[in-house]
């Protein structure tokens, strides 16, 4: 049992009758060089902005208690499309991806993804073409070069094509996604499949013998039972954001990945609210060091599948689904007919090394406590590039369990919870319009009292 995430994004393109606007061919950019640190950082910030836009909309329209998606997977699918997009369609894709006017987005993204945490990260992309559909050679070459997307011809027999696609998806995600497509539309001309399989290990594993049944607080009134992983002295970077008040912690994976969890101290929050003033810089403040921390984190299994057509339309990509300019792919008109995305995430105790090994050196420092026992948001970042690989929200980690009414004596409300933060030092460094970062001071460690 490991921490695993396997997202898959599918772009379905169908035939579009010629018509609409004429266009000039976009000039090719000089994109072959390795990305500079500045480009990488700029891309990480852009990806974070795209993540916030995309996830806010997904959360607004979803009724699921838990959500997960891979913005990187969606961005890769869209940037693959951008390889063949022209004029307004290309401009829109760049704007939605916050990529400015740089033509090198597909090259940058694919290059950075090639270098992502070896062993933890497997990127697979494949293109399925309608039998005999004329695709431009240049697009085929670039697709293969950048995304490893060797074109595969559809047979035209629905059952066979479906079986082949689902088999490939299953293999590409190491069995995590078994039945991705249940049907293929008759007029499918081009399928872009983009699968990312993430398999992370905590840098400091949790001791399974400490995992026990505990309460996860859904709101002021109700809890659900969860399997809560625990560590007594876990080396953790954490800090407090103000307005709204959010506890943030960075749990390191091996292979330069981080699980960043955001726990709002109030129950009344929505994803859009939290993400509104959240930027890459807010989540990566300088001068926040690892501390030995008493940690409680629920074991998780999340799976979410969605069609992103409506969401991407709301983001400003309506054109893709009505009359896009994709003449870099083919002179015959194409239209995107579907954007399917699926991710699964599993969090358990396994890791690389025992936490005790690191905590010995830190044992003289005062101890704090970080409990993830109320609704939270999370990101998985690749630390070298700063790219957000996944984003998710957990309202109820055990939706099949019956809710339990809190007993008054053991359910401190927000008032008590916030009272326990009173001794926490207040910083005044501003991030964005009204987001304050409050780093914990070296000497000053209150017990971070969450509901027990």
């Amino acid at each position: 049992n490991q921490e695993q995430v396997s997202p898959l994004t599918l772009l379905k393109l169908g035939n579009q009758e010629p018509g609409g606007q004429t266009a000039l061919k976009s000039p090719p950019g000089v994109c072959s060089r390795d990305p500079t640190p500045e480009q990488t950082h700029r891309l990480a910030r852009a990806m974070m902005a795209f993540t916030a836009d995309l996830f806010s909309l997904v959360a607004q329209t979803s009724t699921c208690p838990n959500l997960i998606l891979s913005p990187l997977s969606v961005a890769l699918a869209l940037s693959h499309l951008a390889l063949g997009a022209q004029n307004h369609t290309l401009q829109r894709l760049q704007q939605v991806l916050h990529a400015g006017s740089g033509p090198c987005l597909p090259h940058l993204l694919s290059r950075l993804c090639q270098d992502l945490g070896p062993g933890a990260f497997r990127l697979a992309a494949r293109m399925y073409l309608q039998k005999g559909f004329p695709i431009k050679e240049d697009f085929l070459e670039q697709s293969e070069q950048l995304f490893g997307a060797k074109p595969v011809s559809l047979t035209g027999k629905q059952e066979d094509d479906l079986a082949n696609i689902n088999q490939w998806v299953k293999e590409a995600t190491e069995g995590k996604i078994q039945e991705f497509l249940s049907g293929l539309p008759e007029d499918t001309v081009l399928l872009l499949l983009n699968a990312i399989h993430f398999q992370g290990f905590w840098r400091n594993k949790f001791d399974p013998s400490l995992t026990q049944r505990d309460s996860f607080h859904l709101d002021e009134q109700f809890t659900v039972p969860v399997e809560m992983m625990q560590a007594r002295t876990y080396p953790l970077r954490w800090f407090l954001l103000e307005q709204p008040e959010i506890q943030v912690a960075h749990f390191p994976f091996k292979n330069n990945m981080s699980f960043v969890v955001l726990v709002p101290t109030h129950f009344e929050w929505n994803v859009s609210q939290v993400l509104a003033n959240l930027s890459w810089d807010t989540l990566h403040p300088p001068l926040v060091w690892e501390r030995p921390t008493k940690v409680r984190l629920p074991k998780l299994y999340l799976k979410h599948q969605m069609d992103l057509v409506a969401t991407l339309s709301q983001l400003g990509l309506q054109e893709l689904f009505q009359a896009p300019d994709l003449r870099g792919i083919s002179e015959q008109s194409l239209v995107v007919s579907g954007v399917q995305h699926q991710s699964t995430l599993e969090l358990s105790e396994v890791g690389v090394e025992a936490a005790a090994a690191t905590s010995i050196a830190m044992s003289r420092m005062s101890l704090s406590s970080f409990s993830v026992n109320r609704p939270f948001l999370f990101f998985i970042f690749e630390d070298t590039t700063g790219l957000p690989l996944f984003v998710g929200s957990v309202r109820n980690p055990n939706p099949s369990a019956p809710r339990e009414l809190k007993e008054q004596q053991d359910s401190p409300g927000n008032k008590d919870f916030l009272q326990s933060l009173k001794g926490f030092p207040r910083g005044d460094k501003l991030f964005g319009p009204d987001l304050k970062l409050v780093p914990p001071m070296e000497e000053d460690y209150p017990q971070f009292g969450s509901p027990k």
């Epitope: 009758e17 606007q21 307004h88 309506q318 689904f321 009505q322």
Partner: antibody
Framework: QIQLVQSGAEVKKPGASVKISCKAS????????MNWVRQAPGQGLEWMGW????????TYAEEFKGRFTFTLDTSTSTAYLEIRSLRSDDTAVYFC????????????WGQGTTVTVSS | DIQMTQSPSSLSASVGDRVTITCRAS??????LAWYQQKQGKSPQLLVY???TLASGVPSRFSGSGSGTDFTLTISSLQPEDFGSHYC?????????FGGGTKLEIK
């Protein structure tokens, strides 16, 4: 030449339904999205939403979700707007307008259909 | 949702005058803005799209400018047929809202 021709004026009682048509000619119907716009007497223009003429998928502005439905008949190049449970504040002129991706504008408009809701 | 604020709401001017109508978006809409003219009892007509491109058949006295959040429609020398209401509309994320309109009247 390109034309959007809408159905005639309607007078309805509160609680009734109405279905307005917008017939397109002079271009390939499925290449351009169709918008619906409302204009109450003496007021400005209100964007109600649009329908993807290729997939048939509608997008509604928040205040037009529920009682309003956009549909298509691609065989006759016609878009429809249906309003259910009519109220007096639905009294307005309703326009259909063609959306052009790439230029991002509504370049051709129907002549408008006046709907009067009165008891 | 992006709100569009148009000013002024009404304007009296004489034939030959230079007239400027402004439209402000509550968020960055890049150059995805259109201007329309509507005469009493008629359908709106497209004047300008993509903030500054003149629609076909529109006289060159009309011009559009701006990008991001602030946009302007200018009529360099007002003609009798230019009177009526003028509306801006954004095309960034849905809903594609209109401005409140500017009623241009003869002085």
């Amino acid at each position: 030449q390109i034309q959007l021709v809408q159905s005639g004026a309607e007078v309805k009682k509160p609680g009734a339904s109405v279905k307005i048509s917008c017939k397109a000619s002079g271009y390939t119907f499925t290449n351009y999205g169709m918008n619906w716009v409302r204009q109450a007497p003496g007021q400005g223009l209100e964007w109600m939403g649009w329908i993807n003429t290729k997939s048939g998928e509608p997008t509604y502005a928040e205040e037009f979700k529920g009682r309003f439905t956009f549909t298509l008949d691609t065989s006759t190049s016609t878009a429809y707007l249906e309003i259910r449970s009519l109220r007096s504040d639905d009294t307005a002129v309703y326009f259909c307008a063609r959306w052009v991706p790439g230029t991002y504008a509504m370049d051709y408009w129907g002549q408008g259909t006046t709907v009067t809701v009165s008891s | 949702d992006i709100q569009m604020t148009q000013s002024p709401s009404s304007l009296s001017a004489s034939v030959g005058d230079r007239v400027t109508i402004t439209c402000r978006a509550s968020g960055n809409i890049h150059n995805y803005l259109a201007w329309y003219q509507q005469k009493q009892g008629k359908s709106p007509q497209l004047l300008v799209y993509n903030a500054k491109t003149l629609a076909s058949g529109v006289p060159s006295r009309f011009s559009g400018s701006g990008s991001g959040t602030d946009f302007t429609l200018t009529i360099s020398s007002l003609q009798p047929e230019d009177f009526g209401s003028h509306y801006c509309q954004h095309f960034w994320t849905t809903p594609w809202t209109f401005g409140g309109g500017t009623k241009l009247e003869i002085k």
